[in-house]
């Protein structure tokens, strides 16, 4: 009797452990979204970037939603958020309107329940892109650890969007859940 | 009988839990590799950096392999990858040939099964390092979340490798597994 | 008998699983500390930043301690550490003492047992902030994966602290535990 219970227990335990491991390691939300170069807005002021790939190349998403240019949280938790934004200009693209540029990124959280928007992270640089050089490039990286609630939305705003590098390795943002909320 | 089974169960469960926790928290692969300054290549174009420390100072590795200048994935999963690359020039460092520099990093994934190489992340800046200043410095940071398969390799390419800062706190890259693949 | 044991087992197992999940996902230490702008030191050389918020806005801490300007580790483990530091100057703030600036961050680990301090990560840039532009901005981001022991302390040093951007989305640092030590 005792031997039978032990064997059965081990078998059930195994499946519990499997379930525990699977629920922990596989259900954790994440996203890595890469810029959709066919739909970059123009302008030099702060602009929200709404067109991102989530299902091609390095783009991917799981247990989060991408809708209307925003990354939507489906599961409460503490997440690590990051963004990498590259800007570039080649003299063959034409003259810049100004040599003094403010190249910035803002990672923003919007709460639908209480309609409000807050900047979680910002980064960038003022640059002097003179005509003495035929090519200019600059990248920004930001990252941080934030408490996100289900329904909250993450979006990316940049200055000078027409200067964005459209490569998937250059301009992207993402998130992954690290921990539950106590 | 029932009391004996309960006690035995708690004991066995404890070890299962212990095993579950250990397998989750301790077997997760990671690496943090710091530049080996004794073997930095020369060149101005994109150069692969093959010499890194994985076992001294801040350098460390677990459940991943470092071989032939590449970080090899041993366990399928979603990983957070990062790199920090610092460039510097002092007037005593040598005769800098140009003030206009393209200081770049490329984090690359190579698949052996299908021999191909793809850039996962890039960052950097064009810089004007004039002789009016005796010292120049610039750092790049990139990071992102990627699906990696066992056998795939991560490598780092930079421009102007002779300008690299050889300190372990300056020039490094790494990875840690966050999640299994569904 | 066998049915009763099975039901009891499922109940006990459930609580074990719950405990396992809670101990894993909720007890993992983290911190995200944002600059306290009311107490930024002056000077242009390397200065330790000791005033940070851990309990307002985006600032938060769990299973770590913030004391005397340092983030104290309470639990051995491998942690991902990060910092984002923004510098800015507007002509209305007054003239800069010099147009040639070294804008740097150093993320430092101090061990109390063996009184010593080591730089884990550094980043930054030399900048030429000329009077031709009314506004200047620059951000640094660094991040890396490090083994930390209970009692060790993390602190942030910067150059030119008077140029720091005091916004919580601009100047912050943090850590989260990823993995136990084997």
């Amino acid at each position: 009797g005792s031997q039978h219970i032990r064997a059965e227990k081990a078998m059930v335990d195994g499946s519990w452990l499997d379930l525990a491991k699977r629920s922990k390691l596989e259900a954790q939300p994440f996203a890595h979204l890469t810029i959709n170069a066919t739909d970059i807005p123009s302008g030099s002021h702060k602009v929200s970037l709404s067109s991102w790939y989530h299902d091609r190349g390095w783009g991917k998403i799981s247990n989060m939603t991408f809708s209307n240019g925003k990354l939507i949280v489906n599961q409460d938790g503490f997440y690590y958020l990051y963004a990498n934004i590259c800007f570039r200009h080649h003299e063959t693209s034409g003259d810049l309107a100004t040599e003094y540029l403010q190249l910035m990124v803002y990672v923003t959280k919007t709460s639908i329940k209480i309609p409000s928007s807050h900047t979680l992270m910002k980064g960038g640089s003022t640059k002097y892109w003179s005509g003495n050089s035929e090519f200019h490039f600059y990248s920004i990286n930001v990252g941080g650890f934030f408490k996100l609630r289900s329904g909250e939305e993450i979006s990316i705003e940049v200055s000078n969007p027409s200067l964005l590098d459209p490569d998937q390795d250059a301009t992207y943002f993402g998130a992954f859940k690290v921990r539950d909320i106590d | 009988g029932s009391q004996h089974i309960r006690a035995e169960k708690a004991m066995v469960d404890g070890s299962w839990l212990d095993l579950a926790k250990r397998s989750k928290l301790e077997a997760q692969p990671f690496a943090h590799l710091t530049i080996n300054a004794t073997d930095i290549p020369s060149g101005s174009h994109k150069v692969s950096l093959s010499s890194w420390y994985h076992d001294r100072g801040w350098g460390k590795i677990s459940n991943m392999t470092f071989s032939n200048g590449k970080l090899i994935v041993n366990q399928d999963g979603f990983y957070y990858l990062y790199a920090n690359i610092c460039f510097r020039h002092h007037e005593t460092s040598g005769d800098l040939a140009t003030e206009y520099l393209q200081l770049m990093v490329y984090v690359t994934k190579t698949s052996i099964k299908i021999p191909s190489s793809h850039t996962l992340m890039k960052g950097g800046s064009t810089k004007y390092w004039s002789g009016n200043s005796e010292f120049h410095f610039y750092s790049i940071n990139v990071g992102g979340f990627f699906k990696l398969r066992s056998g795939e390799e991560i490598s780092i390419e930079v421009s102007n490798p002779s300008l690299l800062d050889p300190d372990q706190d300056a020039t490094y890259f790494g990875a840690f597994k966050v999640r299994d693949i569904d | 008998g066998s049915q009763h044991i099975r039901a009891e087992k499922a109940m006990v197992d459930g609580s074990w699983l719950d405990l396992a999940k809670r101990s894993k996902l909720e007890a993992q230490p983290f911190a995200h500390l944002t600059i306290n702008a009311t107490d930024i030191p002056s000077g242009s050389h390397k200065v330790s930043l000791s005033s940070w918020y851990h309990d307002r806005g985006w600032g938060k801490i769990s299973n770590m301690t913030f004391s005397n300007g340092k983030l104290i580790v309470n639990q051995d483990g491998f942690y991902y550490l990060y910092a984002n530091i923004c510098f800015r100057h507007h002509e209305t703030s007054g003239d800069l003492a010099t147009e040639y600036l070294q804008l740097m961050v150093y993320v430092t680990k101090t061990s109390i047992k063996i009184p010593s301090s080591h730089t884990l990560m550094k980043g930054g840039s030399t900048k030429y902030w000329s009077g031709n532009s009314e506004f200047h901005f620059y951000s640094i981001n660094v991040g890396g994966f490090f083994k930390l022991r209970s009692g060790e302390e993390i602190s942030i040093e910067v150059s030119n602290p008077s140029l720091l951007d005091p916004d919580q989305d601009a100047t912050y640092f943090g850590a989260f535990k990823v993995r136990d030590i084997d």
Epitope: - | S42, S44, S93, L96, A97, L101, S130, L163 | -
Partner: antibody, heavy 122, light 107 residues
């Protein structure tokens, strides 16, 4: 066609001065570091000055430091060498040479002018 | 300063011969060596850089090898138009220094 043409050489007395010029054509001059290399009669080659592409860095060996000044005008695609306090041992053919692209700290020369002769004699 | 010692100072060989010139640096220069050809009354021409890389348009009979302090320049099959003086140059650290030259003649 990529070309470098030197001028300004001649006969000068010891202690005198001379200014050499080099006119560049056929390439984007502002993108390249440049040098002057000399060759004494029947002797080997000696590097005497270098200048970065933007002109803010200048380099010299000890033999000419303080006496020679290299400069450039990127708008005019021109390189110069101002030589003061000339000595008999400065007698040589002076070549203008373009530094090839490569490691930013390493200088070798892929395009050379035909040279201009400087004779220092009383 | 890094001294470059070239040998031999002159050599005579027949058309079709394999010709080898050596260059020794006074300290380690890794692979930072260039080789030039200079014909009488003409400017030098770059043949090899970084010890073994042939410059654009240079015939394949010219090759270079070596690292550290010892370097070799080879003409695999000497041609009449190869009559010239050959110089090595270290491009490792300033001041940029040249070898004394090797004069190659036809027997």
């Amino acid at each position: 066609e990529v070309q470098l043409v030197e001028s300004g050489g001649g006969l000068v007395k010891p202690g005198g001065s001379l200014r050499l010029s080099c006119a560049a054509s056929g390439f984007t001059f502002r993108n390249y570091a440049m040098s002057w290399v000399r060759q004494a009669p029947g002797k080997g080659l000696e590097w005497v000055a270098g200048i970065s592409s933007g002109g803010t860095y200048t380099y010299y060996p000890d033999t000419v430091k303080g006496r020679f000044t290299i400069s450039r005008d990127n708008a005019k695609n021109s390189l110069y060498l101002q030589m003061n306090s000339l000595r008999a041992e400065d007698t040589a053919v002076y070549y203008c040479a373009r530094r090839d692209y490569g490691d930013v700290y390493e200088w070798y020369f892929d395009v050379w002018g035909k040279g201009t002769t400087v004779t220092v004699s009383s | 300063d890094i001294q470059m010692t070239q040998s031999p100072s002159s050599l005579s060989a027949s058309v079709g011969d394999r010709v080898t010139i050596t260059c020794k640096a006074s300290q380690d220069v890794r692979t930072s060596i260039a080789w030039y050809q200079q014909k009488p009354g003409k400017a030098p021409k770059l043949l090899i850089y970084s010890a073994s890389y042939r410059y654009t348009g240079v015939p394949s009979r010219f090759s270079g090898s070596g690292s550290g302090t010892d370097f070799t320049f080879t003409i695999s099959s000497l041609q009449p138009e190869d009559i010239a003086t050959y110089y090595c140059q270290q491009h490792y650290s300033s001041p940029w220094t040249f070898g004394g030259g090797t004069k190659v003649e036809i027997k």
